[in-house]
């Protein structure tokens, strides 16, 4: 039976995808065939074949970026070390180990789901703009995050969430494969408005909130809070 595992990695980091036999196992590298591939597209990630040092079948996306340890394999550890994780690596990987002495029967089969994440930048909320006498427009921008974010606007006076019908979110997939988001909020003009923009990264369980205040043209920036309804000291910046 195939074992199933999950692992999380930050974009740009290195990650280990685990595929190992119980401790105390010993293997002869002239006997085992090890094959790592992606589960859906069957892209070849890396492999070990006895008396074969060339990895000519490895997909170019993984060449020199995916390695198994020969010393580890002797101990039954066929884990994959994947370097410089990218958003495109978010998929399921399958490790299959066969033994020639056992007639090429399956020794080990593991499917590892890799979840990739990247921190969004601290949101930037533009100063309010008045397209008409009775309307105010705010723009919130945050870039280079993963996966796709959720955006909330908050009434900072009572920490309530504003109706999502008032906002228009545009999410772009940038050249690095990361997400940039621009949210435009349109609300009725009132004498004093104290609002916040919150960017939520569900995978990292992280919310970045920045406030903007109208009335006396005061702008409040760089407030990063644990969730959309928490408050903090002015000018405090904290990661959740």
């Amino acid at each position: 039976d195939t074992q199933e595992k999950e692992v999380r990695a930050m974009v740009g980091s290195d990650v280990e995808l685990s595929c190992a036999c119980p401790e105390g196992s010993r293997f002869d590298l002239n006997d085992v065939y090890v094959y790592w591939q992606t589960s859906e597209s069957k892209t070849v990630v890396t492999y070990h074949i006895p008396q074969n040092s060339s990895l000519e079948n490895v997909d170019s996306r993984y060449r020199n970026r995916a390695l198994m340890s020969p010393a580890g394999m002797l101990r039954g550890d066929f884990s994959l070390r994947l370097f410089n994780v990218t958003p495109q690596d978010e998929q399921k990987f399958h490790c299959l180990v066969l033994s020639q002495s056992l007639g090429f029967q399956e020794v080990l089969s593991v499917e590892v789901t890799l979840h990739v994440a990247a921190n969004f930048s601290v949101p930037v909320v533009s100063a309010p703009h008045s397209p008409s006498q009775d309307e105010l427009t705010f723009t919130c921008t945050s870039i280079n995050g993963y996966p796709r974010p959720n955006v909330y606007w908050i009434n900072k006076t009572d920490n309530s969430l504003l109706d999502q019908a008032l906002q228009n979110d545009t999410v772009f997939l940038n050249m690095r494969g990361l997400y940039d988001v621009v949210s435009v909020l349109r609300i009725a003009r009132t004498p004093s408005v104290n609002i916040g923009c919150c960017i939520e990264n569900v995978l990292l369980q992280q919310n970045l909130t920045v406030g903007s205040q109208t009335g006396n043209d005061i702008g409040e920036r760089d407030k990063i809070t644990e969730n959309p309804v928490s408050t903090g000291e002015k000018n405090a910046a904290t990661w959740s």
Epitope: K42, T43, Q105
Partner: nanobody
């Protein structure tokens, strides 16, 4: 029940050629979506993986057959082939096709290949 039926073996002189076929039948299993291999077993020796075609399309060969053997498939016929050229007496064995990994309950009778010098 999945069945693999090999054919195309025979007696051939050294330097000759043979083309082995393996038809997959039974429940809905597709050659296209399955990693398949050609194996061989000579008397008194352990089974060898001669040629492998992984489900992603990458192909690997035993060093001693590289440049001489070619594995291919016909998805429409649900059949996998092994074209064997420049045969030598060392290639004498029973040839089996099976999945990767080997599944004993899929195994056919194999097809005998004998190369005389």
């Amino acid at each position: 029940e999945v069945q693999l039926v090999e054919s195309g073996g025979g007696l051939v002189q050294a330097g000759g050629s043979l083309r082995l076929s393996c038809a997959l039948s039974g429940r809905a299993v597709s050659i296209a979506a399955t990693a398949m291999g050609w194996y061989r077993q000579a008397p008194g020796k352990q089974r060898e993986l001669v040629a492998a075609r992984w489900s992603g399309g990458s192909i690997q060969y035993l060093d001693s057959v590289k440049g001489r053997f070619t594995i291919s498939r016909d998805n429409a016929k649900n059949t996998v082939y092994l074209q064997m050229n420049s045969l030598t007496p060392e290639d004498t064995a029973v040839y089996y096709c099976n999945t990767l990994p080997w599944r004993a309950n899929y195994s056919g009778q194999g097809t005998q290949v004998t190369v005389s010098s």
